[in-house]
């Protein structure tokens, strides 16, 4: 059965300087491969967070993703700035063998509105 990626909120509003949570759950961890968050779409999309061990300033996972059955890949963005506004996508990849990982499913996106303090 196909993996489903769910982003329950179509949009969230957050005041500049505050934190916000972007929710994302998946229905399966198979096929194996990382889950990443992007802002925007297409060639110009920006990698925001990857659940592959690297450190990303201001962003952290919400749940304990070291649980082997974890299906919650929500993130918290701290100290939000106006530059953080945009649509965020939670994306499930299948690991590549000798080629790059392949995107297999994306959530519907969550638009982040940043309000003036």
């Amino acid at each position: 059965t196909e993996v489903k990626v769910t982003q329950p909120e179509k949009s969230v509003s957050v005041a500049a300087g505050d934190s916000t949570i972007l929710n994302c759950t998946v229905t399966s961890l198979l096929p194996v491969g990382p889950i990443r968050w992007y802002r925007g779409v297409g060639q110009s999309r920006l990698l925001i967070y990857s659940f592959t061990g690297e450190h990303f300033p201001r962003i952290r996972n919400v749940s304990d993703t070291t649980k082997r059955n974890n299906m919650d890949f929500s993130i918290r963005i701290s100290n939000v700035t106006p530059e953080d506004a945009g649509t965020y996508y939670c994306v499930k990849f299948q690991r590549g063998s000798s080629e790059p990982d392949t995107e297999i499913q994306s959530g519907g996106g969550t638009e982040v509105y940043v309000l003036a303090k």
Epitope: P31, P34, T66, R95
Partner: antibody, heavy 118, light 109 residues
Framework: EVQLVESGGGVVQPGGSLRLSCAAS????????MSWVRQAPGKGLEWVAG????????YYPASVKGRFTISRDNSKNTLYLQMNSLRAEDTAVYYC???????????WGQGTLVTVSS | SYELTQPPSVSVSPGQTARITCSGG??????YAWYQQKPGQAPVTLIY???KRPSNIPERFSGSSSGTTVTLTISGVQAEDEADYYC???????????FGGGTKLTVLG
């Protein structure tokens, strides 16, 4: 520098118990899942237990399930393996290992020898 | 018995290329790693996530995968590479960490 130092090994009689410890330093222990891997004399590697970073979820192969218990104390940066109902076939060097994001192992301790013998 | 299969031994002359294979896991549910172990020492991680090499590991060690078989390649083998090499995996479908039985690499001469 990541360091993992095991202790608590020794000689124990069949049916006995032993608790191994692994002191971790050089990384944020509370952010990493951890595992125990053993190696019987002259044999290959065998994974025996894993635990999530927060300690709430544990994992075991059938060979030790119900006899071994993995736990951790993040305030002390220490990993534990409680071994009960020990058998001769549990004789091995026991290594603690840090897990990567996808549950492979990137750093290993030097190991501690457990001998189960009457 | 071991869930992953690798050859018991491989022999190679210094300067040549050694290849050690590992099979048995489902490609859709497994990640793979390679570990080196010298006599009396703890294992050392050479490759993780199929083909990622820790920063302290020489570039002559590389990992690759094709279908359900993964391969450790050691280019320009040196005498110090003589050791046991273990293929290890993480199986997402069972939450377990199987190993291969190990391959003894002998450097001839």
């Amino acid at each position: 520098e990541v360091q993992l130092v095991e202790s608590g090994g020794g000689v124990v009689q069949p049916g006995g118990s032993l608790r191994l410890s692994c002191a971790a330093s050089g990384f944020t222990f509370s952010s990493n899942a951890m595992s125990w891997v053993r190696q019987a004399p002259g044999k290959g590697l065998e994974w025996v237990a894993g635990i999530s970073a927060g300690g709430s979820d544990t994992y075991y192969p059938a060979s030790v399930k119900g006899r071994f218990t993995i736990s951790r104390d993040n305030s002390k940066n220490t990993l534990y393996l409680q071994m009960n109902s020990l058998r001769a076939e549990d004789t091995a060097v026991y290594y603690c290992a840090r897990e990567t994001w996808n549950h492979l192992f990137d750093y290993w301790g030097q190991g501690t020898l457990v001998t189960v013998s009457s | 018995s071991y869930e992953l299969t690798q050859p018991p031994s491989v022999s190679v002359s210094p300067g040549q290329t050694a290849r050690i294979t590992c099979s048995g896991g489902s490609y859709s549910s497994y990640y793979y790693a390679w570990y080196q172990q010298k006599p009396g020492q703890a294992p050392v991680t050479l490759i993780y996530s199929d083909d990622k090499r820790p920063s302290n590991i020489p570039e002559r060690f590389s990992g690759s995968s094709s279908g359900t078989t993964v391969t450790l390649t050691i280019s320009g083998v040196q005498a110090e590479d003589e050791a046991d090499y273990y293929c290890g995996g993480y199986d997402q479908s069972s939450y377990t960490n199987p190993f291969g039985g190990g391959t003894k690499l002998t450097v001839l001469g």
